[in-house]
Interface confidence: low
């Protein structure tokens, strides 16, 4: 064999005995008839030698080290060559070593061509025997970044201040290229950055520097993961140890592009994030260790990349092509205060553009899918405007306020479906007629259904909330003077099962002056609770509302008010209540700002309750709660 090393190539070749074997017959390197067991060849030297045995690979190994100095001159960046060529070397287990020294401010990047690298732990070996051992440097201390095989995900490793790369090739391996190149980068301000690229499903096991020994004190190491947007990544820690910190805390930080809470900080003992969509970074940060009893920080973890589970593979069609003035938003439910990372939860349009919230508008058919570990973290809010601009066209026209079935079939809970009902001012009013009579939500008789209708004025300057109403009561219809919003709000997933109970029809009717009229047809044996609009804030100034209460022929109604006085104090005008029998037109008038409220009274025929407010002084608002109870007549008084 002849090995000739060019002058100033900075290459040293060393042939030495490998691990001792139990072979009886020794083997030597023969050079100029001398028998030696170690041969060193330096730059500019040419050596001819042979071996004294037929299978030198069982006895010797060869190390080829090239020193690359980036301190004093330009760096030879680009694809790294195997020098001397493997064809010129004896067939021994060989290790090519590149030792690159650079300034602290210079970043060095090793770029691995396909196949990329797979990190292995202590005691593991590579199937083909080809290993890459990479180490860095902190001042004078060598830090092992890791040992890697082929056929993995690691595509780039960035370091600064220097890098030592050792490529070990078994004697029988035909490889004749290094498989990597070196590039210079700006300072990375940390020990190293390892880039791991997933092109499809798969997993990668990675380790902190020096594993299984301790990670260098107060250092920072980052892994960058490149994951296709349609796949999910989950991180799990296979093994870790914490050192004894004197200052700062050991932690991992996740950086997810587009997240509003970067970086997400975790303790190593925390459950690590899963179901992340797209690229992310993970960083391990050490601490200042106790000098007397430092302990060790080490971490071995796995990243699993797979297709999203369950709902994520399904495509849902939301057909809003026949809708007008409607928008549907799928968004995260509000969560309070937790700084813990939660896996990404995304909704995707056409399976391509994924974001944490998505708004669909009417006039089109939309295909959506979900990338989310727990769809209960999302909800839907829908707004639809029904407006009438021409009173001649709209009068007596009716619209059904129902949640379209396409929306009900989505795997995300509906939170609010709001209809904004707009009428021409002073021309038309509205009447709401439910499929099932409604109950008004009160503290005394709360709604316990899976949904309610929230009815409020939609006039910007008017703060008027009529109340919350749910199926299963006695309110037959609600008439309102002007623009309102009706919001179907769900309170439980069981709304899907109860959806058939929803159903409200709105009709445009001739204009009337009262703010609202409730038509109440009580059922026997149940107490109906009714309260004035804007319960918590008080009926707005100069507002009038009425209740039309039906009493069947064979029943008597007991009307009961729940406090002695209304509590209202008028600044201007008077607040009053009129109770009027519908058949005889006989009426009682009560001054609400002066009189006590009436004692329980009995009504044998249908009657009106009308409440009109004054302009109250602040803090002395008009809030009234009353009930109507039907009992059978004991004596026929007709």
């Amino acid at each position: 064999f002849e090995i000739a090393l060019p002058r100033e190539s900075n290459i040293t070749v060393l042939i030495k005995l490998g691990t001792p074997t139990l072979l009886a017959k020794p083997c030597y390197i023969v050079i100029s008839k001398r028998h030696i067991t170690m041969l060193s060849i330096k730059s500019g030297e040419r050596i001819v030698f042979t071996f004294s045995c037929q299978s030198p690979e069982n006895h010797f190994v060869i190390e080829i080290q090239k020193n690359i100095d980036c301190m004093s001159g330009p760096c030879p960046f680009g694809e790294v060559q195997l020098q001397p060529s493997t064809s010129l070397l004896p067939t021994l287990n060989r290790t090519f070593i590149w030792d690159v020294k650079a300034h602290k401010s210079i970043g060095l990047e090793l770029q691995f061509s396909i196949p990329r690298l797979r990190q292995i732990g202590p005691g593991e070996s590579c199937p083909d025997g080809v290993t890459h051992s990479i180490s860095g440097r902190i001042d004078a201390t060598v830090v092992r970044i890791g040992t890697f095989c082929s056929n993995g995900t690691v595509s780039r490793i960035k370091m600064q201040e220097g890098v030592k790369m050792a490529l070990h090739l078994p004697w029988f391996h035909p490889r004749n290229v290094s498989g990597f190149s070196i590039a210079n980068r700006s300072s990375i301000k940390r020990l190293c950055i390892i880039e791991s690229v997933f092109e499809g499903e798969g997993s990668a096991t990675l380790m902190s520097a020096n594993y299984p020994e301790g990670f260098p004190e107060d250092e920072l190491m980052t892994w960058q993961f490149v994951v296709p947007a349609h796949l999910r990544a989950s991180v799990s820690f296979l093994n870790f140890n914490l050192s004894n910190c004197e200052r700062k805390e050991e932690r991992v930080e996740y950086y997810i592009p587009g997240s509003t809470t970067n970086p997400e900080v975790f303790k190593l003992e925390d459950k690590q994030p899963g179901n992340m969509a797209g690229n992310f970074n993970l960083s391990l940060q050490g601490c200042d260790q106790d000098a007397q009893s430092p302990g060790i920080l080490r971490l071995q973890f796995q990243v699993l990349v797979q297709h999203p589970q369950n709902e994520s593979n399904k495509i849902y069609v939301v057909d809003l092509s026949n809708e007008r003035a409607m928008s549907l938003t799928i968004e995260p439910r509000p969560v309070k205060q937790s700084r813990k990372f939660v896996p990404g939860c995304f909704v995707c349009l056409e399976s391509r553009t994924c974001s944490s919230n998505l708004t669909l508008t009417s006039g089109s058919k939309h295909k959506i899918s979900f990338l989310c570990d727990d769809l209960t973290r999302l909800w839907m809010n829908v707004e639809k405007t029904i407006s009438c601009t021409d009173h001649r066209y709209c009068q007596r026209k009716s619209y059904s306020l129902q949640v379209p079935s396409d929306i009900l079939h989505l795997p995300v809970e509906l939170h609010d479906f709001s209809w904004k009902l707009l009428v021409p001012k002073d021309r038309l009013s509205l009447v709401l007629v439910p499929a099932q009579k409604l109950q008004q939500h009160t503290h005394e008789k709360p709604c316990n259904t899976s949904f309610s209708y929230l009815v409020a004025s939609a006039i910007p300057s008017q703060d008027l909330y009529f109340g919350s109403f749910c199926p299963g009561g006695s309110i037959k219809q609600i008439q309102v003077k002007q623009n309102i919003s009706v919001t179907l709000r769900t309170f439980a997933p069981s709304f899907q099962q109860e959806a058939s109970r929803q159903g409200l029809t709105v009709s445009f009717i001739p204009y009337f002056k009262e703010e609202g009229v409730f038509t109440v047809t009580p059922d026997t044996k149940s107490k109906v609770y009714l309260r004035t609009p804007n319960w918590d804030r008080g009926l707005p100034s100069l507002t009038s509302v009425s209740w039309n209460i039906s009493v069947p022929r064979d029943q008597v109604a007991c009307l009961t008010f729940f406090k002695e006085r209304s509590g209202v104090v008028c600044q201007t005008g008077r607040a009053f209540m009129i109770i009027q029998e519908q058949r005889t037109r006989a009426e009682e008038i009560f001054s609400l700002d002066e009189d006590v409220l009436p004692k329980p009274s009995f009504h044998h025929h249908s009657f009106w309750v009308n409440i009109s407010n004054c302009s109250p002084t602040s803090g002395k608002q008009l809030d009234l709660l009353f009930s109507v109870t039907l009992t059978p007549r004991t004596v026929d008084l007709t």
Partner: antibody
Framework: QVQLVQSGSELKKPGESVKVSCKAS????????MHWVRQAPGQGLEWMGW????????TYADDFKGRFVLSLDTSVSTAYLQISSLKSEDTAVYYC????????????WGQGTLVTVSS | EIVLTQSPATLSLSPGERATLSCRAS??????LHWYQQKPGQAPRLLIK???QSISGIPARFSGSGPGSDFTLTISSVEPEDFAVYYC?????????FGQGTKLEIK
């Protein structure tokens, strides 16, 4: 309206303890995190830590671990800062402030409590 | 931890002039930076959130720029009531840190 009202000034001797209160009104205490900030005489602002008002879990900056304790009494909508083994360098104005969102900006502040430690 | 460096330490201006206050972070902190104003004997007051978002009730002459690691608070035309100390605050990661402050004084 939202208000954070802190307890009055305190004069303490080294080695003693002090407990500063911060009463929240005009909003639900548990809907926002509560943070504490120190300002030594003539100096800048130092973030001390925060308390998760839903769980009561405190988090401290490194320089405020050990002698400083953040606590809460939701029944009276009040957050507390207790400092034990007082030192002269603890002389400062201590502010409580309400944290908004996950990456807090402090939209409401208490008026501050001056704690003076002198022998 | 994120170190915030404010400059200048003191800025002397006359009313009506434009004030430019700088805050530099030791690393990129996206837009997780807020600005506060503090007058003697008072608690700080939030001026700008998330680098450039305005706060209700704060005059429009206050504006901020970002994101990244270099941030600026600009007062387009300084009013007499604007003379105070201004602090930037990082909300990027624990611990939340403040800059050392810039004092805006009357020239």
């Amino acid at each position: 309206q939202v208000q954070l009202v802190q307890s009055g000034s305190e004069l303490k001797k080294p080695g003693e303890s002090v407990k500063v209160s911060c009463k929240a009104s005009g909003y639900t205490l548990t809907d926002f995190s509560m943070h504490w900030v120190r300002q030594a005489p003539g100096q800048g602002l130092e973030w001390m830590g925060w308390i998760n008002t839903e769980t009561g879990a405190p988090t401290y900056a490194d320089d405020f671990k050990g002698r400083f304790v953040l606590s809460l009494d939701t029944s009276v909508s009040t957050a507390y800062l207790q400092i034990s083994s007082l030192k002269s360098e603890d002389t400062a104005v201590y502010y409580c402030s309400r944290g908004r969102d996950y990456d807090p900006h402090f939209d409401y502040w208490g008026q501050g409590t001056l704690v003076t430690v002198s022998s | 931890e994120i170190v915030l460096t404010q400059s200048p330490a003191t800025l002397s201006l006359s009313p009506g002039e434009r004030a430019t206050l700088s805050c530099r972070a030791s690393q990129s902190i996206s837009d997780f930076l807020h600005w506060y104003q503090q007058k003697p004997g008072q608690a700080p007051r939030l001026l700008i959130k998330y680098a450039s978002q305005s706060i209700s009730g704060i005059p429009a002459r206050f504006s901020g720029s970002g994101p990244g690691s270099d941030f600026t608070l600009t007062i387009s035309s300084v009013e007499p009531e604007d003379f105070a100390v201004y602090y930037c605050q990082s909300a990027h990661s624990f611990p939340y840190t403040f800059g050392q402050g810039t004092k805006l004084e009357i020239k």
